[in-house]
């Protein structure tokens, strides 16, 4: 009998909402044993998969995908699923990043420019918190965000 | 808003030993909680950290010698699974969050002291 | 892994005098990387998060710059309130053995 799969988690690092410019990682986590971590958009056509699947405790895998320049597109909900033989498992709750416009960030004119890419697999950490303090002590001009429907 | 860490105690090595950390005036249910060592004249060492969805991060060191679980809107713990001599420190518990990062730490308690000696 | 290194471990500088420390990290953390002061029996206090945003109530005395890989703490006008041990923090990401640089003990003559 196939075993019922637990549903993953999300988290980013440092976390959900970030400096335009700064890098943020995604972290998914599920059971051992998993193949493949995926790492959706809203729309599920939208996504990136990877088999570099760590683990996280005795019961647990994680994968990180990291974004190395986040831009206003890439502000928006974002879930995990995984591919754990012979099967996959349900969707993660959604994580809502944010993307803060502020000065002073790496990409700012007295600084080096940085690179720049979509998700690309690497790592980071915070997780769909619904009840999270709103970004107390921001120093923010603008909050790019992206409306959804669940 | 405040952070207090049980009263430290000096224990023999190898006795598994639970730290208690305790807020006032707001609910750990709405932020990340970390805790902090320091051994007796050196710098701040990270253990680890428990997310609102009950995920727990660790040091590379400390994975497998010390487990953080909420154990209610107001409690968390650090559990020494096995203590050497040199996990004697004050122990310090942190709150992340702020500013929506996870583990930027912006309230501490006071610290406690734990000794580990034969 | 990442690694935080801190440096001097220790400074001597005079009342009105100026201070500087700084902190290399290991690989690029952005501008995720904040200062904590700790003076002896208490625990650590945030100065500056996001590499140069002052802390709310925390004199502009101390000022942080930096990204990607190096920051400086600087603190002029020194007063002797300010005699204590100086710590950089990364919070880009948990794969490390320590979030924290080794620290920077300042003394004021």
């Known amino acids: 009998q196939e075993e019922d799969l637990p549903r993953p988690s999300i988290s980013a690092e440092p976390g959900t909402v970030i400096p335009l410019g700064s890098h943020v990682t995604f972290v998914c986590r599920g059971p051992v044993g998993v193949q493949t971590f995926r790492l959706e958009r809203e729309s599920r056509s939208t996504y990136n998969d990877t088999e570099d699947v760590s683990q996280a405790s005795p019961s647990e895998s994680e994968a990180r995908f990291r974004i190395d320049s986040v831009s206003e597109g890439n502000a928006g909900p974002y879930r995990c699923i995984y591919y754990k033989p012979p099967k996959w498992s349900e969707q993660s709750d959604y994580l809502e990043l944010l993307v803060k416009e502020t000065s002073g960030g790496p990409d700012s004119p007295d600084t080096e420019p940085g690179s720049s890419a979509g998700p690309t697999q690497r790592p980071s950490d915070n997780s769909h918190n619904e009840h999270a303090p709103a970004s107390q002590g921001l120093k923010a001009e603008h909050l790019y965000h992206h409306h959804h429907h669940h | 808003q405040s952070l207090q860490e049980s009263r430290g105690r000096l224990v023999t090595p190898g006795t598994p030993l639970t730290l208690t950390c305790t807020a006032s005036g707001f609910s750990l249910s709405s932020y990340h909680m970390g805790w902090v060592r320091q051994a007796p004249g050196k710098g701040l060492e990270w253990i680890g950290y428990i997310h609102t969805n009950r995920n727990t991060w660790y040091a590379n060191w400390a994975k497998g010698r010390f487990t953080i679980s909420k154990t209610s809107s107001t409690t968390v713990n650090l559990r020494m699974t096995s203590p050497t001599t040199e996990d004697t420190a004050t122990y310090f518990c942190a709150r992340g969050s702020y500013g929506d990062y996870n583990f930027l730490f912006d309230v501490w308690g006071p610290g406690t002291l734990v000794t580990v000696s034969s | 892994e990442l690694v935080m290194t801190q440096t001097p471990a220790s400074v001597s500088e005079p009342v009105g005098g100026t201070v500087t420390i700084n902190c290399q990290a290991s690989?690029?953390?952005?501008?995720?990387l904040a200062w904590y002061q700790q003076k002896p029996g208490q625990p650590p206090k945030l100065l500056i998060y996001?590499?140069?945003t002052l802390e709310s109530g925390v004199p502009s005395r101390f000022s942080g710059s930096g990204s990607r890989t190096q920051f400086t703490l600087t603190i002029s006008d020194l007063e002797c309130a300010d005699a204590a041990t100086y710590y950089c923090?990364?919070?880009?990401?948990?794969?490390?053995?320590?979030?924290f640089g080794g620290g920077t003990e300042v003394e004021i003559k």
């Open positions: 690989e690029d953390i952005s501008i995720y």
């Open positions: 996001d590499a140069s």
């Open positions: 923090q990364q919070y880009s990401t948990t794969d490390t053995n320590n979030l």
